[in-house]
């Protein structure tokens, strides 16, 4: 059965997945897909890496961890109820049928209704893209609103704070961890 993770509408969801590269930077291709892991590849791919970096992506999906050390956990920015469902993390180890597959269930809950807070920094308005500890370059025009010139390393901690802290507990006990080499 899938490991279950929860987030509220409007939050960033976090789906953990890890492997241990044979050597730092000696990466194994990874894909993330919406839907349970099929026999090969990922269905409905939302993000993919090759041996070097992220080479396929969709706008709200990011790898916030140090994927060159095997942290390929997926962050989904500003989730909606439609993001609920099974996600596949597939570690594409070379060789026939060597892939490691992890199915993770994401449950999105409606946002809690709270009194209007005192004015806070609107993170997604100020920085419409998700933020990561490694640069992913300039804003794309599919993003609404203007994006100031930002330093991603300085504000990655803000992105981390947006994670539902409950999802961060006992990540490495989730079973979504393998060792390669």
């Amino acid at each position: 059965s899938e490991v279950e993770y929860r987030a509220e509408v409007g939050q960033n969801a976090y789906l953990p997945c890890f492997y241990t590269p044979a050597a730092p930077g000696n990466l194994v291709p990874v894909c993330w897909g919406k839907g349970a892991c099929p026999v090969f590849e990922c269905g409905n791919v939302v993000l993919r890496t090759d041996e070097r970096d992220v080479n396929y992506w969709t706008s709200r999906y990011w790898l916030n961890g140090d994927f060159r050390k095997g942290d390929v956990s997926l962050t989904i920015e500003n989730v909606t109820l439609a993001d609920s469902g099974i996600y596949c993390c597939r570690i594409q180890i070379p060789g026939i049928m060597n892939d490691e597959k992890f199915n993770l269930k994401l449950v999105i809950k409606p946002a809690k209704v709270t009194p209007a807070p005192t004015r806070q920094r609107d993170f997604t308005a100020a920085f419409p893209r998700m933020l990561t500890t490694r640069g992913h370059g300039p804003a794309e025009t599919q993003t609404l609103g203007s994006l100031p010139d930002i330093n991603l390393t300085q504000i990655s901690t803000l992105a981390n704070e947006l994670r539902d802290s409950r999802l961060a507990n006992d990540l490495r006990d989730s079973g979504a961890t393998i060792r390669i080499g």
Epitope: G25, R48, R52, D53, V54, N55, Y56, W57, T58, S59, R68, T133, R134, G135, H136, G137, P138, E140, T141, Q142, D149, I150, N151, L152, T153, Q154
Partner: antibody, heavy 118, light 106 residues
Framework: QVQLQESGPGLVKPSQTLSLTCTVS?????????WNWIRQPPGKGLEWMGY???????SYNPSLKSRITISRDTSKNQFSLKLSSVTAADTAVYYC???????????WGQGTTVTVSS | DIQMTQSPSSLSASVGDRVTITCKAS??????VAWYQQKPGKAPKSLIY???YRYSGVPSRFSGSGSGTDFTLTISSLQPEDFATYYC????????FGGGTKVEIK
Amino acid sequence: QVQLQESGPGLVKPSQTLSLTCTVSGYSITSGFAWNWIRQPPGKGLEWMGYISHSGSTSYNPSLKSRITISRDTSKNQFSLKLSSVTAADTAVYYCARGYRSPWFAYWGQGTTVTVSS
Amino acid sequence: DIQMTQSPSSLSASVGDRVTITCKASQNVGANVAWYQQKPGKAPKSLIYSASYRYSGVPSRFSGSGSGTDFTLTISSLQPEDFATYYCQQYNSYPTFGGGTKVEIK
């Protein structure tokens, strides 16, 4: 093996629009990566101009944003650069390059020289 | 925008020398730096990405290091084919390049 090849006129008149095309072979531009334009004025350094991603979204250097358009023709596996209102300062070698989401550039075209002159 | 200041702008060295090129970012760019080699009339070639990872096929004499604002490209033992111009590039924000370092034969 991925290959990129720039093409277009080598001479453009001031105030006109520079148009270049990059033809990609060995990889579908819709399958992944960001497809970039980078230029290098004679004897000078490199300047990133912008990209179009595998999904069709674009991103431009703020200094060129009012003049630049990058588009693609997926049926021909090509992407194109248009730069309007050119001046002599736009004289350069123009490269197309394949980049990652983090835009660093593993594959480059051979480059094409464009001179802006009347 | 983020400025990348490369030094020296040129250097003379002999085959077998150890060569070090530095690049300083105007603000913190993490490890989001790449290095390229360019020979006259040719397109740049990728050497290093993410500050320290060697691109496939690049000889082991090339190495990169640094994080934050200070980065270094080292050629441990210069070979005849290494005489070229080298550029650093940051990609923490929209990409910007250093001004280049020309490595010439002494």
